[in-house]
Each structure stands twice: as structure tokens, then as C-alpha cells.
Amino acid sequence: QRKRRNTIHEFKKSAKTTLIKIDPALKIKTKKVNTADQCANRCTRNKGLPFTCKAFVFDKARKQCLWFPFNSMSSGVKKEFGHEFDLYENKDYIRNCIIGKGRSYKGTVSITKSGIKCQPWSSMIPHEHSFLPSSYRGKDLQENYCRNPRGEEGGPWCFTSNPEVRYEVCDIPQCSEVECMTCNGESYRGLMDHTESGKICQRWDHQTPHRHKFLPERYPDKGFDDNYCRNPDGQPRPWCYTLDPHTRWEYCAIKTCADNTMNDTDVPLETTECIQGQGEGYRGTVNTIWNGIPCQRWDSQYPHEHDMTPENFKCKDLRENYCRNPDGSESPWCFTTDPNIRVGYCSQIPNCDMSHGQDCYRGNGKNYMGNLSQTRSGLTCSMWDKNMEDLHRHIFWEPDASKLNENYCRNPDDDAHGPWCYTGNPLIPWDYCPISRCEGDTTPTIVNLDHPVISCAKTKQLRVVNGIPTRTNIGWMVSLRYRNKHICGGSLIKESWVLTARQCFPSRDLKDYEAWLGIHDVHGRGDEKCKQVLNVSQLVYGPEGSDLVLMKLARPAVLDDFVSTIDLPNYGCTIPEKTSCSVYGWGYTGLINYDGLLRVAHLYIMGNEKCSQHHRGKVTLNESEICAGAEKIGSGPCEGDYGGPLVCEQHKMRMVLGVIVPGRGCAIPNRPGIFVRVAYYAKWIHKIILTYKVPQS
């Protein structure tokens, strides 16, 4: 099946991306060619290359190939954005699972099933052997990585560094075990690239051997990356076109996730009385078609046989005989009980009257010219001309007055989070408006997030499960108390302001809350001399979806030896991968007899793409999130740590780079934590601090 022209299917494509070598010792090879397929063939066969090719870049403008002996995960390399470049990485080198017997596995696992470190293939100590890299060209017998050069039954193996154990298999999972989907896999964005019978999938951006309509550029939201299995058309499960000219398409063997819940982003807005959009989220009980003919039950095959069963279309709520839209039709429908009428639309269900019409904005909304004049909390906007003095106070250029008409929501200060307005309410001087970004608008609000263009430091100077006790320089750490109980952490970023998480406020009554500062013990034992107890006077909720809250203290904290503020990072900055950071908290520790002391766990920053891989492709991180993995297995934040900081150091300056929010379980081995990226919200924080009145000390 593996003909020369098809080798491009063995590569993962990253559009508009190239690799820059920071380490000058790394080699590359270039040549003029016509197509990316030609680059792929040469990389796969290593023809005329002085190294093992792991990736290549196709320069579309110059029609040039750049072949690399490294990929984006190698050290001494960084990714860079470039319109004319497409990066292709050999999947065998970036997969962390095996297909079949793992003959093609070229990953970096180097520990055996029982935990013994592997012996390097080029070494004869402690075991002599004939598996020399020179004898097995193309099998990548590099370093001491697990390999299966002869395609033997047990999968990848290695000689061990233990003289008592000659060789042992490595515990590398099958890709079909690692990959899983929810519902019928419409939201599946994993890396399975072969069908249930083992056929390699055809790339979605190719029309050979099978012509098809599912072009990635035509369906940007369907996840048509490379040749991965997808379900763009409401099939019972993901599938792909195959490279076998005689088999047009086949289903893929992807199991259902044990945690079979959909991400919020995957779920259409559920309605019961009316239809939103095409009605895919309609969950009402209308059970006749437009002309009154009753619907057939979804779990029945009479009078019409069909495969739209509740079993085949999980999560589509095919209950009873209610009208539904499980397959992306134009509106909810059903099979009818009339043997002569197979299906009918339930067009009598009214359309939801969308509030504010179809109002939306593109990018960050700086060009929004709609006529909404109300904040998200329902306050009426006040006239722009009455607020120009305040506006000038926090922007350093002349706003476009022609746009600031009446009291309409606008974005004159280039706010990353969309249109807003002044309110005339002294407690809430301004707030965002309830307008969403236009559907399908993917304009980033921060450009080039993954490249360390902007330094995070301004100047050059959790449960934390299994964490260790800490006492030094943590004066910014806040214990938020709810009815006498520690509920969350927080960071003192200004004398009157604490940065914390939205989930920390079960009650709306601010009298139920206190902020404890200067403590080390969760109950304040032994901290009497340094403890400051402050009431909470206001909660300012972050931009929509941020999970952040700025908590205003009733009076400013007194900064002393035990209470201090922590710095914020520069807006839109990126902290380099592998930077060592820490999370702090008084939350769940897993200890039977917890001493009540603040604990710290050490984590390291991980790029969003790699982080997503560690989450088995089940989460796609965006520009508002930051990821950090544990240095010590099984340590990380948990309940009681939420709201607390992820603290990193750059240029000898400590900053709060992330905020702990409830995630997908606590301290799961090899599952890095996902935090709110403070750098993405830094302008919002500064704007609040600048514009909200605080009591004077």
C-alpha cells in the first residue's frame, strides 16, 4: 500500500510554520522542488541526505525543500510563523503510541515495562548484542530508545542497563488504546490515521486516490488535519478515505472515552422551546412534523428502517419520538409514523428570538459599529462624550471620536476582550458588553503566542498534592475564607486587589468572605503577629470565559515583612518552554495528617501543542491558557488551591503567570495542569486597577 507518491501521509502538517535552529551545530539540507510530496518522498527514503530526516519545510514561495534531522520537539530548535512555509513532521518521531507491533515506532521512551533504564544500542555494556545502528539502517536505533527493528510480537523493546535482565519490552500503548472519542466523535480531534482494518488514511487535502468534497479550506471547523480520522457528516463514528484505491472509505477504531462528557465548546446551545441556528441543540418535546403527522420513535424500525438510533447517535438525545437534528440537517426532523412519508421537518417549532439580533464583532471589536448600549450586567451605557477625560487617562493616543457616537458599545482602547462602555455607576465605572465574536472568526487577539517575542518580566531585576512546605517570600499569597473556612487561594497584586478564580464564590453575599494575608498556616495558628484579615468590598469578574475575578479589599493591605504584592507579566508575553515555575496552595494534599502549612509544587512550562498531546488530544488550548507539567509525578494543584498562582521567575523577577482553576482531575501523572494565562488578561487587570476607585489607607 505504501507507494512512493503516498509518503506525505506519514507526516503531520503545520501550516504557515517553519523551524529555526538555535543550535548552529544542527545540519539542514535544501533543494528546489515543485511539490511537498517530492520533499516527503526524499525525507522518507533519506535519499541523498547526510542524516536521518525527521521533518521538512516546504517553502511555497521559493518552491524549495528544507530537510531537517530534528523536529519541533527537539532541543536547539524553535517554531516560527511564516506565510510561505509549511512544516511537515514525520509522525513516527512525534507519536507516543504504537501501531500494530510498533515496527515504525521512533519515539523517545527509554524505560522498560518494569521501569529499568534501556542500554544504548551503540553500547555493548552490560549486554553484548548484534543490533548495531549500522546494521539496522532506517530502524532508528538511536540513543537508548525502545525499538522493534524486526517487528517482533511483544512490541518495542530494548536491552536493559541491568546486567541481570538482558532485554525487556517497553510499556508503550497502542494508538487505538490511547485515542478515544465522545459521543459519535464529531468533536474528535485526535491523531488516529488508519482505519479499523489497518488501511492508511488519505490526506484530507489530497484528491488521490479518491476525489471528495471535504476540503480543509472549505470546512475550517471540521479539523481536517493531515490524514486523521474525522466525523464531519454525522456518521456513527469517525472515518477516513483510504489509500487503497479499491476501498473509498472506512471507519476508524476509536474507542469511547471513559469520561464520556462533551467539552462545553462542542455542545450546541441547548433549547427546549425554540430553534437556535439549525436546531442541533433542540431538546424540546415537539413530536409531530409540520403538518401534524406524529413522529416514529427513534429506537423503532417501524414503519421506516434507519440507522439513526440512540446507540449510533449518542449525545444527540434521540429520546422517545421527539423532533431532533442529529445529522446537521437544516432543522429538527423525524421519521414519521405514516408508511408513505419517510421523514418530515418540524418547521412549526419557532426560531429563538436572538437577543441583540445577530450582533457580533471581529478580532477584538475595535471596528465594531453596532448599536448595543448595555453592559453584560444589564447596566445602561453612559455617553462617550461625558467620559472622554477618563478615557484619556488610560490610553496614550487620541481616540477616533467619529466612532464614539451616543452611548454605543465600542473599543476605543484596543481592549483584547471586545467592546465595552462606561456605565455612570461609580462602583462599576465600565464593563464589557454582551456581544460575542463572530462565528468562525479566528483572528488571534495576541499574535505569535508560541514565540518568545515579548519578555514577561517588566525589568531585569495547589492541593498542592505531594508538595513540600514553604515559608520564603510568599507574602503575596492570600487565603480566601468563606464562612470561616479556607476556600481558595489568591494573589495580592496591589494593596487593594487580589487576583483569584470565579469558582471561589459560592455565595453572592460578600459578608461571607474574608481575605487572610501574611499567614503560613491555613488556620492562622502561629501567624497572629503577621496575619491581616480584610473584608471583601467588590468582585470584578473577568472577561467572558476567563474564569478570573479581581477581588477588591475593603481597605488596602499594609505591606510589611509578611505581606507583599506580586508582579504581573507583560501583556501577551510568552514564558519559554521548560521554565521552572511553582504553584502554591492550602488545598487537598493527599496526606492523612496534613499540618496545615502552605505547600508548593514545582512545575515546568509546556507549550500548548505538546500539552494538548499529553491530554491525548482531548483538549485544545487557546491563547488564554498556559500549561505546566509536574517535575515530581503526582504533584500539582487540587481542590482548595483554586484561585492561587502559578509563579514563574524571569530575569530574577517573580510573576504570577497563571491562575489555578478547576480542571480535569488533580495531579494525574503525565497530565499537565492547565491554568488561566495571566499575560493574556494583563491589560484588563491594569485597566481595572486604574479605573476602579479603591479606599485610601
Epitope: P506, R525, G587, I592, G596, E639, P662, G665
Partner: antibody, heavy 120, light 107 residues
Framework: EVQLVQSGAEVKKPGASVKVSCKVS????????IEWVRQAPGKGLEWIGE????????NYNEKFKGKATMTADTSTDTAYMELSSLRSEDTAVYYC?????????????WGQGTLVTVSS | DIVMTQSPSSLSASVGDRVTITCKAS??????VSWYQQKPGKAPKLLIY???NRYTGVPDRFSGSGSGTDFTLTISSLQPEDFATYYC?????????FGQGTKLEIK
């Protein structure tokens, strides 16, 4: 080993009071909240309230304010709950459980339960 | 008060079956949900905390998921000792409340 040992079963007349004890061992008593829960015969679990032994701070379910009073003695590592003005509907098994040191924690160790029967 | 509605209220299954119990909260409780197992005449035992974290010593056939208002306890392959009553409980809003229980019986 963490243990919560409760006092024995009690039979009381309507209008009387009863004091249930919960002696803990195996961890620092003062640092974790003690939760009190009741379970009427054949019914589900109902939260009564909680106490932090180290400070004496309490939080009650509104339904049990005036009915239950929680105290703790850190010298003997024992928590107490007194129920007053007993009525037949107070017949239940009363459990103490170890809560966490923070709000919203789950309850990892439970006493064996004390059956309180109210009957004339 | 937040109402925790468990379903089903009773369930018959066989050893080796996969069983799912759901719990719906009347308001958002984030991930502050625990699952407990109770056998007749005994105190409840903690299985899952924080909606999805398995408590120490609990077999890995038990798993929890969910956030917000919808939560699930799954037993992947029933063992004889798993027949009991299961309760979900929320610790996000006073007063703490529990579901009415799901009695798991042998088929």
C-alpha cells in the same frame, strides 16, 4: 490509623435531649472540620453541620439551628453534638465524619454511627 | 438549597457489567462533588472527590466525571462487593446536600 469512634445507641423520650460523642485518633484533631450527618431509617443522608475543633467555629444547616449544638474538646480529641427537644422524626443514625481543612472538601473517614431512637 | 437528583434510584446488574449512575445538581456546583458507597448497617465510604479524583485505595474500576451540573459515577466492571447504595454529595454551597441514593442490586 485514622479512627472516629462514636458513642453507643440511645433511646429517648419525646422532648428529651441527647448528646452524641465522636472520639478521633490518628490525626491532628484541631486541624480538620468535623461534619455531622444523619440518616433516617431507609432514607438518604442529610447534613446537620460542622465544627472546626481548633477554633470552635461552626456552620449549621438552617434546618437544624436550634435543634443541634456542636462542641469539641481538644484535650480529649472528642467532638460532641447535642440534640434537643427530640421528636419521633429525629429517630435516625447520626454519623460524624472527618471533613477537610478547606471548604468543599469530601469526607474521608466516618464514625460507625449512633442510632438515636425517639419513642414514647 | 441545591437539590442533587440521582438516577436511576435503583438498578439491577450482573457481575462484569458496566454501570453508570448520574447526578444532576439544580445549580452549578463546579467540581465540588463526591461519591460515596454505603452498605447496609455501615457508614458511607468515600470513592470519588472533586468529581473525578479516585480516593486512595479505591479500585480503578470506579471513575467519576462531570462539572457544573451534570456528574457521573461509572463502575467499569461490577464485582460482587460493589452491590451497595451509592450517594453523590455537593460541597459547593451551604447547606451541603446529597442525592437520594442509587441502590445497586444483583440481577
Amino acid at each position: 490509623e485514622v479512627q472516629l469512634v462514636q458513642s453507643g445507641a440511645e433511646v429517648k423520650k419525646p422532648g428529651a435531649s441527647v448528646k452524641v460523642s465522636c472520639k478521633v485518633s490518628g490525626y491532628t484533631f484541631s486541624g480538620n472540620w468535623i461534619e455531622w450527618v444523619r440518616q433516617a431509617p431507609g432514607k438518604g443522608l442529610e447534613w446537620i453541620g460542622e465544627i472546626l475543633p481548633g477554633s470552635g467555629n461552626t456552620n449549621y444547616n438552617e434546618k437544624f439551628k436550634g435543634k443541634a449544638t456542636m462542641t469539641a474538646d481538644t484535650s480529649t480529641d472528642t467532638a460532641y453534638m447535642e440534640l434537643s427537644s427530640l421528636r419521633s422524626e429525629d429517630t435516625a443514625v447520626y454519623y460524624c465524619a472527618r471533613g477537610g481543612h478547606y471548604y468543599g472538601s469530601s469526607w474521608d473517614y466516618w464514625g460507625q454511627g449512633t442510632l438515636v431512637t425517639v419513642s414514647s | 438549597d441545591i437539590v442533587m437528583t440521582q438516577s436511576p434510584s435503583s438498578l439491577s446488574a450482573s457481575v462484569g457489567d458496566r454501570v453508570t449512575i448520574t447526578c444532576k445538581a439544580s445549580e452549578n456546583v463546579v467540581t465540588y462533588v463526591s461519591w460515596y458507597q454505603q452498605k447496609p448497617g455501615k457508614a458511607p465510604k468515600l470513592l470519588i472527590y472533586g468529581a473525578s479524583n479516585r480516593y486512595t485505595g479505591v479500585p480503578d474500576r470506579f471513575s467519576g466525571s462531570g462539572s457544573g451540573t451534570d456528574f457521573t459515577l461509572t463502575i467499569s466492571s461490577l464485582q460482587p462487593e460493589d452491590f451497595a447504595t451509592y450517594y453523590c454529595g455537593q460541597g459547593y454551597s451551604y447547606p451541603y446536600t446529597f442525592g437520594q441514593g442509587t441502590k445497586l442490586e444483583i440481577k
